[in-house]
Interface confidence: medium
């Protein structure tokens, strides 16, 4: 204000942010600030975060005469104290038939046989624990495995000698190996019977299976 003009401390009001001006002397004033503000003209926001109650990793965000908690994804509520039920929010959180189990600050999956990982998306490598005989090839399946045998070997684990190698089945019969005991099984053509299909049979009988 110039020397020739009349200075009135509260006209216009120097108080900001809704503060009210009170003249305290000929040239002095005082601002009464609204909650959440301070300063000689109420210009400064009071930081409400120093005594915040945000929990579980929540970050305090100052407001005007208040604060909010920015919660990590696993928590919710005013102070991040309420657990988020991920099983409700994400119905497909667990894959391949796994069962979702909500926990404080997270969730877990109970996987069905053959699957593992946080969301049951990883097929367990059953070959890692398989006992296929050396020289055979292990094929991983869901909750199981199979052994692909080299020539001359048979059985679930390729641990048996293949009885069909010696061509025990006669007369063009089909030879199969019993995977449990390694013995040969001859499927005889029409008109033959016996363990190795060497016997003639009466007419009217069809194919015969013989185990040995």
């Amino acid at each position: 204000a110039g020397s020739d003009s009349l200075y009135v401390p509260c006209a216009p009001s120097p108080c900001v942010n809704g503060g009210t001006c009170r003249q305290t002397g000929d040239f002095t004033f005082e601002c009464n600030c609204l909650p959440g503000f301070e300063g000689s003209t109420c210009e400064r926001n009071i930081d409400d975060c120093p005594n915040h109650r945000c929990q579980n990793g929540g970050v305090c965000v100052d407001g005007v005469n208040t604060y909010n908690c920015r919660c990590p994804p696993q928590w919710t509520g005013q102070f991040c104290t309420e657990d988020v039920d991920e099983c409700l929010l994400q119905p497909n959180a667990c894959q391949n038939g796994g069962t979702c189990a909500n926990r404080n600050g997270g969730y877990g999956c109970v996987c069905v046989n053959g699957w593992s990982g946080d969301d049951c998306s990883e097929n367990i490598d059953d070959c890692a624990f398989a006992s296929c005989t050396p020289g055979s090839t292990c094929i991983d399946r869901v909750a199981s495995f199979s052994c692909m045998c080299p020539e001359g070997k048979a059985g679930l684990l390729c641990h048996l000698d293949d009885a069909c190698i010696s061509n025990p089945c006669h007369k063009g019969a089909l030879c199969d190996t019993n995977p449990l005991n390694g013995q040969y099984i001859c499927t005889c053509p029409q008109g033959y019977k016996g363990a190795d299909c060497t016997e003639d049979v009466d007419e009217g009988n069809s194919h015969h299976h013989h185990h040995h």
Epitope: P14, V16, T24, G25, T28, E30, C31, N32, E38, G39, S40, T41, E43, R44, N45, I46, D47, D62
Partner: antibody
Amino acid sequence: EVQLVESGGGLVQPGGSLKLSCAVSGFTFSDFYMEWIRQASGKGLEWIAAQRNKANDFSIVYSASVKDRFTISRDTSKSTLYLQMNSLKTEDTAVYYCSRDGGKWGLDAWGQGTLVTVSS
Amino acid sequence: DIQMTQSPSSVSASVGDRVTITCQTSEDIYSGLAWYQQKPGKSPKLLIYGASRLQDGVPSRFSGSGSGTDYTLTISSLQPEDFATYFCQQGFKYPLTFGGGTKVEIK
């Protein structure tokens, strides 16, 4: 005319104490927030302490770097602002300024500064 | 605490040039920003307060603008006495924080 004049700086050993003064004139001292700011040689400005005005009960706020070591106060009868500095560290070496917070987000008057050197 | 990012850290300019300095804050400070000029061995001098209001006695070639988190100090036509270091400062909440400074040098 608004004036602020600091004094009390000097050389002090680590762990020692020093009290800075800032004599003010030209305005109603009790109506204003007062601040202490420091500046290490060739560096930026760092706010360290404030004392609010009479309307706000002369309450105090400190920066984390000096809390529990420095104390700001004022004597209105002497129109002087003080900064008592205890447990001084080498990193407290700086020029210390007192300033008047004019409201409206600006520090509108500054002293000339006083140099504090903490060294053994 | 509110972080202040001031750029550039230095600028070389000639008399008559237009110089722009920016200051970015880590959160909205609702125009609660001041700009200061400091010359070697001297104390800072308030130029702009409230982001855009010119302090009494400061030449009109200095101007401030901005809102939210982005603020600018502009010197429209650089004068010899303007070669100095400039600082921004937020006064929106304690602790008060300053930008790192911009040194305006002669090209």
